[in-house]
């Protein structure tokens, strides 16, 4: 397994609708035709997998139908969007990139993007 540099923003603020987007960029050490991208969430020293997708160059990233993630790819950049976030989902979201084909296998893990999610205030009842 060979190491590869992965860059991602340090901080992102989710929208009021609970949507957060960030770019995950990897420094490909050579030709890559198949790439696997995994988003990990680290909170309280626990790491869980949020979503993952394998894509062949020239294709869109396809996450599972029930995934909270969507994404697009362009060259060595992956634009990731996570939706349905609540305040309790605030945490460090780490981008992991694997170059699956052709060999050799490369693995890169970003430093993480701290996503802050603030639940919207409920609207006060209005009298008409």
């Amino acid at each position: 397994c060979k190491a590869m540099h992965v860059a991602q923003p340090a901080v992102v603020l989710a929208s009021s609708r609970g949507i957060a987007s960030f770019v995950c960029e990897y420094a490909s050490p050579g030709k890559a035709t198949e790439v696997r991208v995994t988003v990990l969430r680290q909170a309280d020293s626990q790491v869980t997998e949020v979503c993952a997708a394998t894509y062949m160059m020239g294709n869109e990233l396809t996450f599972l139908d029930d995934s909270i993630c969507t994404g697009t790819s362009s060259g060595n950049q992956v634009n990731l969007t996570i939706q349905g976030l609540r305040a309790m989902d605030t945490g460090l979201y780490i981008c992991k990139v694997e170059l699956m084909y052709p060999p050799p296998y490369y693995l890169g893990i970003g430093n993480g993007t701290q996503i802050y999610v603030i639940d919207p205030e409920p609207c006060p009842d209005s009298d008409f």
């Epitope: 050490p29 050579g30 030709k31 035709t33 198949e34 394998t54 020239g58 084909y101």
Partner: antibody, heavy 119, light 113 residues
Amino acid sequence: EVQLQQSGPVLVKPGASVKMSCKASGYTFTDYYMNWVKQSHGKSLEWIGAINPDHGGSSYNQKFKGKATLTVDKSSSTAYMELNSLTSEDSAVYYCARDGSIHYVMDDWGQGTSVTVSS
Amino acid sequence: DIVMSQSPSSLTVSAGDKVTMSCKSSQSLLHSGNQKNYLAWYQQKPWQPPKLLIYGASTRESGVPDRFTGSGSGTDFTLTISSVQAEDLAVYYCQNDYGYPYTFGGGTKLEIK
């Protein structure tokens, strides 16, 4: 010795579909991508797409999306390409070509399948 | 898509002559990550499938005679045959191997007098 044995020539009517095969031997089928290449008579080569025989994921040249469908049968080490809604423009020789084991460029080719579309 | 352009489209030479043919790509095939050029050369003889001659712009495929030499970097590449033999009668194609979609040049047809 790596061998890619392709199915024989076909004559089909416009609007029909055709499915050709490429049987691989002499290596581990699931380890290397299989590419498909089109060559119209007297013309250059066009890359149609590639498939990963391990999981069936594929990538297509935009020009051939909707025209070609790539599949594999791991149990028989065979790759397939289906072409649909055929027109005279699809008359050509179609090659399967394996990614090489050292440099991952197309270094082993089938003998080609000739497709003629005519009414 | 990367466009590959080859010249000349055809040339006629005598056995023993030195031949050079050119291939240009619309964007660089030099990968910044490993400094490799992702360009391949193929030879296609009449009624046969293409055969890989050169990969990585300059590395000869196993079994290819050393009279075939590939050179160049970035967007400009050359295939040289130092002393043409009768069996070299073929069409020679260059191919962008940098990434999908792979693209080929229009070919250079080599004919022997």
